[in-house]
């Protein structure tokens, strides 16, 4: 039988609420027409529509359906941007403070080596803070030019006080010596397999957060294709073609189009699932060697007793060091005036004891729950993007791309859609080249975190022991001692409390040598302020 | 890239001397010393000495000490060693070697070999 | 005078892991040093400083050191790693050392 006559015989509310999308009315018919130069919304009778409207109507379609996919992904969005942020600066902020416990260190155990000891501290930590950026540095290179550049202060300033000038040629050779008799003992090994380690997870934790927030800016800027456009307008537009203003298409013809329009994208959901449980795995292993908080907060100890392990073979040393290094080859010495303070930042912080403590550890975990509530984005974005767009409840008396119906049938949709395109063929097309380019980053960034992670890739999990080292833990409680013994040593119990508000009560009494309480930046602290309900310390 | 390249083989008599040659390319002649290891017949590594191109300062295995002497032309870097007083034992290949850093140091490039055969 | 002591031999089966270990006193204050050398051919450096790598030396061999012990470790093993291996370290009382020597066969 032949359909009804559209109910508004003069394409009235069709030309107003056109008006809307597109001011002038001169493509809007104003009594409905035959349409046969129609593509999209196709009529069983006279219509409402001509060419440009469904033009207009296709170009709508995809603006409204990129604009749903953005609101679709804006939480998830948020919630890595604003951790990549947080952590980077974090992480920034627990190298300052390294930097300072070391330089602290120096100052009160070693007040002879500041001036060139700071300097070799300062651009130790600054290669640490580029690494973590992903900067090409080799973490052994670095450790071993910090000991290359110490020891020779250390054998003219504090085992050799005396040497003449003239015998401040064989730096050179000092360098050489420091590694060829191994004279900081192992400490050097250690630090280098505790730092690599810790850093290499750090490095790929901030490399993995910004590849999440890249696959969601990719997706959330996909360009829909011509074919998933008409289907879209079909859907949402061609109701209107023939007067059905107040008519909402069917949930479950909407959710085939989505799956139609959808396809490329819904291909990474095998592998943001593989991201989010292998990102967990990573963050579940962070912890002792493997924490940088934990490992670079504690350097300034382990130097501290590699200079120890030099003082107490000192006599040998100097007597080898005499043989080794006589007639040496000359280099110039660099010699400098640095002022005392100049490298100390006047920030070594106390350790906040919060009611509610907040370390980067748990603020690791915390996004790894947050991200898992995401872990099936991708495969879920079809119903999402139907859920949140305007469809007919329980699929009664709604629109199914060609008529009203009183139920949906999802074989008798297919059937009439047959003759206009096929929507098994728009899955078949397969991704978009932007997306296959980013599930190539997301196999790849996924590769990286199961070699890393420890329970599976046990890359990172030879036991220092192993390598001859004393490991240096201070056993499995949760006080984890990583300061040493000595003058002017401090316990850090349990990490910093950086997130509590960056907790920067100061109280010399317990950091390492500063000499004054200081203010921290308002920036610093205004990063954190959203990270929990925090009783802040701060006065 | 670093190349050391040793003279030929020589056959001496008990009691006479030997000279062996090391010319050095590849990098700064001066910066690295140059050890001289020898190697007999079937038998392992034994170190014979070493020289600073740099500052000519040389410093030799003790079971060597007045035997051997070991010099270094800087102009075309090359190094020397020579070994007085061959006994047959002294026979096998000589090696010249260059420091990695110190006197104390690794050896990160080897020449080729020369074979020394002491016989009557 | 230092006294550096290897096994003589080390036999091992293809793609399996070989251990040339290096024993002297207190040798893990020391800088231990590996070298290859394979029939007719000069030493190559294979391991420096106890466990670094020269650059052209696959990731297959590498080094540990601690107490009165040094390791030379080989895994994987391939038909081209069949050679003798020395370690070597220097000490200010006897200078430059070298171990006994270990011949590695890949059965």
């Known amino acids: 039988q032949p359909p009804p006559p559209p109910p508004d015989a003069t394409c009235h509310q069709v030309r107003s609420f056109f008006q809307r999308l597109q001011p002038g009315l001169k493509w809007v018919p104003e009594t409905p027409v035959p349409g046969s130069d129609l593509q999209v919304c196709l009529p069983k009778g006279p219509t409402c529509c001509s060419r440009k409207m469904e033009e207009k109507y296709q170009l709508t379609a995809r603006l409204n359906m990129e604009q749903l996919l953005q609101s679709a992904s804006m939480e998830l969005k948020f919630l890595i941007i604003q951790n990549a942020a947080v952590f980077q600066e974090a992480f920034e902020i627990v190298v300052r403070h390294a930097k300072n416990y070391t330089n602290a260190m120096f100052k009160n155990n070693y007040p002879s080596l500041t001036p060139q000891a700071f300097e070799f501290v300062g651009e130790f930590f600054t290669d640490v803070s580029l690494y973590i950026l992903g900067s090409d540095i080799n973490v052994d290179d670095m450790v071993n030019e910090l000991f290359d550049s110490l020891f020779p202060v250390i054998y003219t300033q504090l085992m050799n006080p005396g040497l003449p000038d003239s015998a401040l040629d064989i730096n050179e050779c000092l360098r050489g010596a420091r590694r060829d008799l191994k004279v900081f003992g192992n400490f050097p090994k250690l630090i280098m397999t505790q730092v690599s380690k810790s850093l290499q997870v750090t490095r790929i934790f901030l490399q993995a957060l910004n590849l999440g927030i890249e696959v969601i800016n990719t997706t959330d800027h996909l360009k829909f294709s011509k074919d998933c456009g008409r289907m879209l307008t079909r859907m949402w537009y061609c109701s209107y073609c023939q007067g059905l203003m107040m008519v909402k298409p069917c949930g479950g013809y909407c959710n085939v189009v989505m799956q139609g329009c959808m396809a490329g994208v819904v291909e990474i959901d095998k592998y943001w699932r593989e991201y989010i449980l292998s990102l967990e795995e990573l963050v579940n292993g962070m912890y002792r060697i493997y924490d940088m908080e934990n490992v670079l907060l504690g350097l300034f100890s382990t130097i501290h007793d590699s200079i120890q392990y030099v003082q107490k073979n000192a006599g040998k040393l100097t007597t080898t060091i005499g043989k080794l290094c006589a007639h040496s080859q000359q280099r110039q010495y660099r010699s400098a005036y640095y002022p005392e303070d100049l490298f100390i930042d006047k920030k070594v912080l106390k350790v906040a004891h919060v009611e509610h403590e907040e370390t980067l550890s748990s603020r690791r975990r915390e996004l790894i729950q947050k991200l898992k509530s995401f872990i099936s984005f991708y495969s879920a974005l079809p119903g999402y993007i139907c859920s949140h767009s305007p469809v007919a409840e329980n699929d009664t008396l709604c629109w199914n791309g060609q008529e009203l119906v009183e139920r949906y049938s999802q074989k008798a949709a297919r059937n009439g859609m047959k003759n206009q395109f096929n929507l098994h063929e728009l899955k078949m097309k397969g991704p978009e080249p932007v997306v296959s380019q980013i599930i190539d980053k997301l196999k790849h960034i996924n590769q990286l975190l199961r070699t890393m992670s420890m329970p599976k890739g046990r890359v990172l999990d030879k036991n220092l022991d192993e390598e001859g080292f004393e490991s240096g833990d201070c056993g499995d409680d949760e006080d984890e001692c990583i300061g040493g013994s000595g003058d002017g040593m401090i316990k850090v119990k349990n990490q910093l409390r950086f997130l509590a508000e960056l907790a920067y009560d100061l109280d010399v009494d317990d950091a390492p040598g500063n000499s004054q309480q200081a203010t921290p930046k308002d920036n610093e602290i205004s990063t954190f302020h959203n990270l929990g309900n925090v009783h802040s310390p701060l006065k | 890239q670093v190349q050391l390249v040793q003279s030929g083989a020589d056959v001496r008599k008990p009691g006479a001397s030997v000279k062996v040659s090391c010319k050095a390319s590849?990098?700064?002649?001066?910066?690295?010393?140059i050890s001289w290891v020898r190697q007999a017949p079937g038998q392992g590594l034994e170190w014979l000495g070493w020289?600073?191109?740099?500052?000519?300062?040389?410093n030799y295995a003790q079971k060597f000490q007045g035997r051997v002497t070991m010099a270094t032309d800087t102009s075309t870097s090359t190094a020397y060693m020579e070994l007085r007083s061959l006994r047959s034992d002294d026979t096998a290949i000589y090696y010249c070697?260059?420091?990695?850093?110190?006197?104390?140091?690794?050896?990160?490039?080897w020449g080729q070999g020369t074979l020394v055969t002491v016989s009557s | 005078q230092s006294v550096l002591t290897q096994p003589p031999s080390v036999s091992v089966a293809p793609g399996k892991t070989a251990r040339i270990t290096c024993g002297g006193n207190n040798i893990g204050s020391k800088s231990v040093h590996w070298y290859q050398q394979k029939p007719g051919q000069a030493p190559v450096l294979v391991v420096y400083d106890d466990s670094d790598r020269p650059s052209g030396i696959p990731e297959r061999f590498s080094g540990s050191n601690s107490g009165n012990t040094a390791t030379l470790t080989i895994s994987r093993v391939e038909a081209g790693d069949e050679a003798d291996y020395y370690c070597q370290v220097w000490d200010s009382s006897s200078d430059h050392v070298f171990g006994t020597g270990t011949k590695v066969t890949v059965l």
């Open positions: 070697a260059r420091g990695k850093r110190t006197l104390a140091s690794c050896f990160d490039y």
């Open positions: 020289i600073s191109p740099y500052t000519g300062n040389t």
């Open positions: 590849g990098y700064t002649f001066a910066s690295h010393g």
